[in-house]
Interface confidence: medium
C-alpha cells in the first residue's frame, strides 16, 4: 500500500489486498469499506466515494461484514415439528431445530430443513442405537433371554425375569411369567431403561419440510462487486 493512502476508498498496489473489513471493488478498482452485520450496501463505492450502508429491513439480516446490495430474507416461521431456537434479527437468521422425539432428516447450514419422527421399535425389538439430533433410532431384535413389550423410541431389550418355576416362558416380546411369588431379575450388562422423551406422540404424523431459505453463504458472494482476495476477508 502506498504510504499516502489511508482512508477508503483507495487504490491498492496492483494485485495487493485490501485491509480487514474492506473489499476490492473491481469496477471502481478501489479498496472500499464493507458494511457491518445488520446492514447492507445501499450504494456501492466509486473512485471518489465510499460504500454507503443502510440497516436491514424487518425480517431480513446480514450476519457478516459484507457488501451485498440487499439483506438476506430470514427463513419463514418454524413448522409444527420444530422449535425456534434463534429468533430472526437484523444480524442473524431464524434457526429452527426439531422437537423432542424428532430428528433432523435434512439439515441446512444452520438449523433443520426437514424433521422426521424418531423410529419406534415395536415389541420384540429394542433400541440398538438411540436417536440423536441428526440421526434416527436403530432397532434390533431382542436376543434370546431378553424382551421388549413396548412400541418405543427409547426402550432397550430387557432381560427376562428368572423364575424358580416358570409358568409361561418369555420370548422376544414378552417377559417370562413365574409361578413363584419372588422372581429375580437378571442383571445383564446394559440393562438400563432409557429416559422417556419430554413429549411423545401416539400416532406417526407425516413430517413437513421447513421452507427453504437463501443459502447462508450468499452474503459472501454478492452479484455486484467482486469478492475480496483470500487474506483480506474476515472480520
Amino acid at each position: 500500500l502506498p504510504a499516502q493512502v489511508a482512508f477508503t476508498p483507495y487504490a491498492p498496489e496492483p494485485g495487493g489486498t485490501c485491509r480487514l473489513r474492506e473489499y476490492y471493488d473491481q469496477t471502481a478498482q478501489m479498496c472500499c469499506s464493507k458494511c457491518p452485520p445488520g446492514q447492507h450496501a445501499k450504494v456501492f463505492c466509486t473512485k471518489t466515494s465510499d460504500t454507503v450502508c443502510d440497516s436491514c429491513e424487518d425480517s431480513t439480516y446480514t450476519q457478516l461484514w459484507n457488501w451485498v446490495p440487499e439483506c438476506l430474507s430470514c427463513g419463514s416461521r418454524c413448522s409444527s415439528d420444530q422449535v425456534e431456537t434463534q429468533a430472526c434479527t437484523r444480524e442473524q437468521n431464524r434457526i429452527c431445530t426439531c422437537r423432542p422425539g424428532w430428528y433432523c432428516a435434512l439439515s441446512k447450514q444452520e438449523g433443520c430443513r426437514l424433521c422426521a419422527q424418531l423410529r419406534k421399535c415395536r415389541p420384540g425389538f429394542g433400541v440398538a442405537r438411540p436417536g440423536t439430533e441428526t440421526s434416527d433410532v436403530v432397532c434390533k431384535p431382542c436376543a434370546p433371554g431378553t424382551f421388549s413389550n413396548t412400541t418405543s423410541s427409547t426402550d432397550i431389550c430387557r432381560p427376562h425375569q428368572i423364575c424358580h418355576v416358570v409358568a409361561i416362558p418369555g420370548n422376544a416380546s414378552m417377559d417370562a411369567v413365574c409361578t413363584s411369588t419372588s422372581p429375580t431379575r437378571s442383571m445383564a450388562p446394559g440393562a438400563v431403561h432409557l429416559p422417556q422423551p419430554v413429549s411423545t406422540r401416539s400416532q406417526h404424523t407425516q413430517p413437513t419440510p421447513a421452507p427453504s431459505t437463501a443459502p447462508g453463504t450468499s452474503f459472501l458472494l454478492p452479484v455486484g462487486p467482486s469478492p475480496p482476495a483470500e487474506g483480506s476477508t474476515g472480520d
Partner: antibody, heavy 116, light 107 residues
Framework: QIQLVQSGAEVKKPGASVKVSCKAS????????MSWVRQAPGQGLEWMGW????????TYADDFKGRFAFTLDTSTSTAYMELRSLRSDDTAVYYC?????????WGQGTLVTVSS | EIVMTQSPATLSLSPGERATLSCKAS??????VSWYQQKPGQAPRLLIY???NRYTGIPARFSGSGSATDFTLTISSLQPEDFAVYYC?????????FGQGTKLEIK
C-alpha cells in the same frame, strides 16, 4: 507464482471465428477484473474492454462492441475472448491482463492472423 | 474518449543519460495513469501506477510524476536493458486508453 497462460497462435480465414483462452493461476481468479488488449503488428496498445470475474459482466470499448465477446469459466479460472466475422484488420496479438488500474500481470499474447 | 498523447515519438539517448518521457491527457484523469515498458516480442510490463507509485520489483531509477493532464516518466540513468517502447495509459474513465508509445533507442 501468478501466471496468465494464453492459447496458441491461430490462422483464420475472413468471416471465421476465433476463441482465445487465458488460464489464470497463482491467485484468486474472481478477485481481479480481466482486461483484454489488442496490438496490431507494429502498432500500439488498444484497450478492448474487461470482464468482471465475479459477476461475469463484460464491458467493451466502442470499437470492440458487436463482434467481440468476453466470457469466463470460473471453475477452471479461465477467461475467453471470442471474435466473430473475422476481417484482415483483426490480425493482431491479443493479450489478457489482470486488473484495470495498473495492469500488473499479462498473458504472453496470442497472435491471430486473418488471411485468405 | 480521453486521448493520451505521448512525446516524443522517438527518443535517442546513450546509456547513463537521463530520459524524460511525456504523456498528456485530453481531459483530467486525476492520477489514474500507469506506465508500461514493452520490448520486441514480449508482453508489456507495469512500471508505474497511480502516476507516481513504482510497482514491486521496478528499479528506483524509474519514477513517475504528474496529475490531472500532464504526466512524466523519468529514467534517471539509462541502462542497456531500458531501451524499449514505453506506453502510458489512463484508467480513469471508459474507454481506458493508451498513448501511442515512445520508442527509447540507443543513440
Amino acid at each position: 507464482q501468478i501466471q496468465l497462460v494464453q492459447s496458441g497462435a491461430e490462422v483464420k480465414k475472413p468471416g471465421a471465428s476465433v476463441k482465445v483462452s487465458c488460464k489464470a493461476s497463482g491467485y484468486t481468479f474472481t478477485t481481479y477484473g480481466m482486461s483484454w488488449v489488442r496490438q496490431a503488428p507494429g502498432q500500439g496498445l488498444e484497450w478492448m474492454g474487461w470482464i468482471h470475474t465475479y459477476s461475469g459482466v463484460p464491458t467493451y470499448a466502442d470499437d470492440f462492441k458487436g463482434r467481440f465477446a468476453f466470457t469466463l469459466d470460473t471453475s477452471t479460472s479461465t477467461a475467453y475472448m471470442e471474435l466473430r466475422s473475422l476481417r484482415s484488420d483483426d490480425t493482431a496479438v491479443y493479450y489478457c491482463a489482470r486488473g484495470l488500474y495498473g495492469v500488473d500481470y499479462w498473458g504472453q499474447g496470442t497472435l491471430v492472423t486473418v488471411s485468405s | 474518449e480521453i486521448v493520451m498523447t505521448q512525446s516524443p515519438a522517438t527518443l535517442s539517448l546513450s546509456p547513463g543519460e537521463r530520459a524524460t518521457l511525456s504523456c498528456k491527457a485530453s481531459e483530467n484523469v486525476v492520477t489514474y495513469v500507469s506506465w508500461y515498458q514493452q520490448k520486441p516480442g514480449q508482453a508489456p510490463r507495469l512500471l508505474i501506477y497511480g502516476a507516481s507509485n513504482r510497482y514491486t520489483g521496478i528499479p528506483a531509477r524509474f519514477s513517475g510524476s504528474g496529475s490531472a493532464t500532464d504526466f512524466t516518466l523519468t529514467i534517471s540513468s539509462l541502462q542497456p536493458e531500458d531501451f524499449a517502447v514505453y506506453y502510458c495509459g489512463q484508467s480513469y474513465t471508459y474507454p481506458y486508453t493508451f498513448g501511442q508509445g515512445t520508442k527509447l533507442e540507443i543513440k
